[in-house]
Amino acid sequence: MMTGTIETTGNISAKKGGSVILQCHLSSTMAQVTQVNWEQHDHSLLAIRNAELGWHIYPAFKDRVAPGPGLGLTLQSLTMNDTGEYFCTYHTYPDGTYRGRIFLEVLESSVAEHSARFQIP
């Protein structure tokens, strides 16, 4: 039975050219996290963090994605095209997979605010 919940940074906004931290947190379960996949709105994978094998950043994102903090992901040099949904998939044993959603809005405006409150989707 899957008892856990994924908390995410929810809807966030950040400045074009700036950076943003995408963060998910799995709580309320004793399941062991074996892997976390970070996926973009078009289903392309940004990065994978395997508990035993470490991080893999996909080549297309190598220059703009930094692993961490923790199981999160830092997206750098933001462009307007980065606006959209991001998903974290937690592969766990024995529960199975949990999925969280973050919506990132990249703004031209210098008043863009990077809100980092956690939300339960």
Partner: antibody, heavy 121, light 108 residues
Amino acid sequence: QVQLVQSGAEVKKPGASVKVSCKASGYTFTSYYMHWVRQAPGQGLEWMGVIGPSGASTSYAQKFQGRVTLTRDTSTSTVYMELSSLRSEDTAVYYCARDHSDYWSGIMEVWGQGTTVTVSS
Amino acid sequence: EIVLTQSPGTLSLSPGERATLSCRASQSVRSSYLAWYQQKPGQAPRLLIYGASSRATGIPDRFSGSGSGTDFTLTISRLEPEDFAVYYCQQYFSPPWTFGGGTKVEIK
């Protein structure tokens, strides 16, 4: 061309250990992960584990945790799979398989010819 | 872990016929993280398809893969004598990576 050549057949007694080798050629050995998969007589395929290019990182299927050890020797471009505390159910053909990508994608692109391990008293 | 169920267990067909093999996952395999392998008696498996529909190097175009989510299909458009073998699907979305039980394609 890419080739994986495995060591010869082994007959072992229950409780013993076996070490199977897999010698790689035709590619940059230090750029790819190597998987191990086994197949019991008349049965399907079962993933056992994977080892990283440098040998520093390994990941094992829960079922084999504590009983299987993967190592690699860069000087001879060889990967080893050692399985301990053998029982009759470990009688199988053991395959090494090189990953398709420069990380642990899980796509097993090139396979060794297989090594038959028979466990019998 | 993700369990893959292949059907049918055995497919009896004649050369020149079309073969359709099915693979169903116990949970969604996102981004089509599914591969197909062919294995002939006494030989190692051979990668045919990855990403659900991309053919591996050197694989003839009579082999095609399709599907997403939990339902995937391998199609052999016109069976050649060398295609009679066992076919396995494998997911590489969620560790541990798992294989289906296989479908044997035999000569009718």
